[in-house]
Interface confidence: medium
């Protein structure tokens, strides 16, 4: 359903959105897979407390998603 709330991004997905342009821009020859691998290495080398901003944002989006999906389901119910 195109009207359904969009799927949730993970903390890692949010991190990738932030740093993918830099990796791609600085290394234009890298394949999509290599860019993903580099981002994965960066994320894995990041301490838990440094991942917090992304985890907090992902949790906020999850909260919003749950509210949106509840509203969407309620809207879809017949009277």
């Amino acid at each position: 359903d195109p009207n359904a709330p969009k799927r949730l991004p993970s903390a890692f997905f949010l991190f990738c959105s932030e740093y993918r342009p830099k990796i791609k821009g600085e290394h234009p020859g890298l394949s999509i897979g290599d860019v993903a691998k580099k981002l994965g290495e960066m994320w894995n080398n990041t301490a838990a407390d440094d991942k917090q901003p992304y985890e907090k944002k992902a949790a906020k989006l999850k909260e919003k998603y749950e509210k949106d999906i509840a509203a969407y389901r309620a809207k879809g119910k017949p009277d």
Epitope: E18, G25, M42, D49, D50, P53, K57
Partner: antibody
């Protein structure tokens, strides 16, 4: 040439506000984390705040948390530091810096902030 | 939070002598996130060494960095007149970065 140029420093009374700007040129500003570092007269370097490439994520030193706000305008290639409730201990040279290749390898010349009555 | 402690506070040496500057982290840190900077009066800091031992562009070969875990060292094999300055070690936390500087070591002319 990669360059950072700070402006907006000056003399301000305790409790006052000031907004620092840092104009970036010579690189794709929107790809990079940006950082403010300060140095009080005769003292060492102190990290103040950093912001992610999109501006969506920020970090602050405990000494400025709740008083300073870092932001950026990627369309203008400009970094900002809004400083409120200024104290005498905020008197320093404020440097704008970024990791162009590795670590903080590009620095501006700094702008001086003096908090005094 | 990780603290970086540098020693000595001041090093008095003559040109031509070697210098050893120490930096100790309050807990083990990855050498990937350890750097050294040089600062001269009235100037912005300049990156010398990153990843504990890699020389930044323009850093002369007489500068070398070493160490791992909690103990790191910046060595200058033979001091040139332009090397008399303040040196800072620094640790980086990631995304967006948070930087912790040591208090600095001043290398002065004896």
């Amino acid at each position: 040439e990669v360059q950072l140029l700070e402006s907006g420093g000056g003399l301000v009374q305790p409790g006052g506000s000031l907004r620092l700007s840092c104009a970036a040129s010579g690189f794709t500003f929107s790809w990079y984390d940006m950082t403010w570092v300060r140095q009080a007269p005769g003292k060492g370097l102190e990290w103040v705040s950093s912001i992610s490439p999109s501006g969506g994520y920020t970090k602050y030193a405990d000494s400025v948390k709740g008083r300073f706000t870092i932001s950026r305008d990627n369309s203008k290639n400009t970094l900002y530091l809004q400083m409120n409730s200024l104290r005498a201990e905020d008197t320093a040279v404020y440097y704008c810096t970024t990791e162009f290749y590795d670590y903080l390898d590009v620095w501006g010349k700094g702008t001086t902030v003096t908090v005094s009555s | 939070d990780i603290q970086m402690t540098q020693s000595p506070g001041t090093l008095s040496l003559s040109p031509g002598e070697g210098a050893t500057l120490s930096c100790r982290a309050s807990q083990s840190v990855s050498s990937t996130y350890l750097a050294w900077y040089q600062q001269k009066p009235g100037q912005a800091p300049r990156l010398l060494i990153y990843e504990a031992s890699k020389r930044a562009t323009g850093t002369p070969a007489r500068f070398s960095g070493s160490g791992s875990g909690t103990d790191f060292t910046l060595s200058i094999s033979s001091l040139e007149p332009e090397d008399f300055a303040v040196y800072y070690c620094q640790h980086r936390h990631n995304w967006p970065p948070q930087w912790t500087f040591g208090q600095g070591t001043k290398v002065e002319v004896k």
